[in-house]
């Protein structure tokens, strides 16, 4: 080994070196939280970049760059260090127009703490292992969601566009001409029935067990879907999102009530099956796999 490499190895294995890097990262994180940093922080930024560069150079000199089994770039944790340094120099010396987008990558510096703190490294390792093991469960989950999204698509496509429209058409009015003139929420409220405090027109359906319109209103399919158009089963992707919402139980009771009002109470069977299979079974299966992966990593 050359004297330079010997010195690099000595520095690399020294505990003070690890402490220096850890303190640098933590101080860097504190500086990144500043709202309006003063001008002198620019010099501090250069110092941090210098320390990170020095750390990487020490590692490269001690272990080699990329040829060989234990070299710098063969360790995935060093990829992060390398990216941090590359972006530090890119944002500083290369004029790339929208630099603010590249500055976002400075946040990656905080992730360097993972590679420095041994306990944290183990936990993250376990997390990555669990993700690898989750692939089969994820495939099963996506498959199940896709199947139910297709069923939902067939059962409820367009149903959430059903609204209670006022009965009388004046002069030469048509639904189409009215819809073309509607602009503000107030305009909508003139023609459609809204429950007090509701931001969407009252949903209704054409079957006997679905929601009915009050006196003087007719159920029509027109306009956009509820929740600014985000809640629907009109395309596979929207249906998939709705199913994901059911699986994660994210305000699912609202989706359930909206759909049952528009389609009919019979369709509660669909929701019972999805909640039992998606929410109770699949979610717990995912948790079980994660728990197993952690157990294996600990052993």
């Amino acid at each position: 080994f050359s004297p330079l490499r010997r010195i690099s190895i000595k520095i690399l294995v020294h505990s003070l070196f690890s402490m220096l890097i850890m303190c640098t990262i933590l101080t860097n994180c504190i500086f990144m939280t500043m709202n309006n940093p003063p001008d002198w922080t620019k010099n501090v930024e250069y110092t941090f970049t210098g320390i990170y560069t020095f750390e990487s150079l020490v590692k490269i000199l001690a272990r080699g760059f990329c040829v060989g089994e234990f070299t710098f770039l063969r360790d995935p944790w060093n990829w992060l260090d390398f990216v941090v340094i590359v972006f530090a120099y890119l944002t500083e010396f290369v004029n790339l127009g929208n630099v603010s987008a590249l500055r976002t990558f400075r946040v990656l510096r905080a992730l360097k703490t993972i590679s420095v703190i041994p306990g944290l490294k183990t936990i993250v390792g376990a997390l990555i292992q669990s993700v690898k093991k989750l692939s089969d469960v994820m495939i099963l989950t996506v498959f199940c969601l896709s199947v139910f999204a297709l069923i939902g698509l067939q059962l409820f496509m367009g149903n959430l566009k059903h609204k209670c429209f006022r009965n009388s058409l004046e002069n030469n009015e048509t639904l189409e001409s009215i819809m073309n003139t509607l602009e503000s929420e107030e305009d909508f409220r003139k023609y459609f029935y809204y429950l007090e405090g509701s931001k969407d027109a009252l949903l209704c359906g054409f079957s006997t067990d679905s929601g009915q319109c009050p006196e003087g209103y007719t159920c029509v399919k027109i306009g956009r879907n509820p929740d600014y158009g985000y809640t629907s089963f009109d395309t596979f992707s929207w249906a998939f999102l709705a199913l994901f919402r059911l699986m994660t139980q994210d305000y699912w009771e609202n989706l359930y009530q909206q759909t049952l009002r528009a389609a009919g109470k019979t369709y509660m069977i669909f929701f019972v099956v999805v909640i039992f299979l998606g929410s109770f079974y699949l979610i717990n299966l995912i948790l079980a796999v994660v728990a197993m992966a952690y157990e294996e990593q600990n052993q």
Epitope: T174, L175, F206, Q212, T218, V220, K221
Partner: nanobody, 120 residues
Framework: EVQLVESGGGLAQPGGSLRLSCAAS????????MAWYRRAPGKQRELVAS??????ISYTDSVKGRFTISRDGSKRWSLQMNSLTPEDTAVYYC???????????????WGQGTLVTVSS
């Protein structure tokens, strides 16, 4: 294209009766509302009666108890007019809010209008 065809208009005596019929031709997936409107000379068009698929029926105050709207099938409906008065003289239009197919939004369709004259 969906078309509404009316029949049954004409001349009637005061106190007499007439029956108007309307049929929807062409592709019809779902009729949301069937209605009859009328336009009296020099007046605006007004809703006379309407019926929904779930059986909800409404009438304008001036015809309650005299006129009866009914569904004669999935694509046909009629207006039975009894105890006619000269004020009932108008062009009667058949109207439907319907979806031509399952993917379409509800659209408005009008008949060409049929003249009802009540005169002695």
């Amino acid at each position: 294209e969906v078309q509404l065809v009316e029949s049954g208009g004409g001349l009637a005596q005061p106190g007499g009766s007439l029956r108007l019929s309307c049929a929807a031709s062409g592709p019809v997936f779902n009729i949301n509302k069937m209605a009859w409107y009328r336009r009296a000379p020099g007046k605006q068009r007004e809703l006379v009666a309407s019926v929904t698929p779930t059986g909800s029926i409404s009438y304008t105050d001036s015809v309650k108890g005299r006129f009866t709207i009914s569904r004669d099938g999935s694509k046909r409906w009629s207006l039975q007019m009894n105890s006619l008065t000269p004020e009932d003289t108008a062009v009667y239009y058949c109207n439907a809010l319907l979806q031509p197919d399952s993917y379409s939004n509800t659209r408005t369709y009008w008949g060409q209008g049929t003249l009802v004259t009540v005169s002695s």
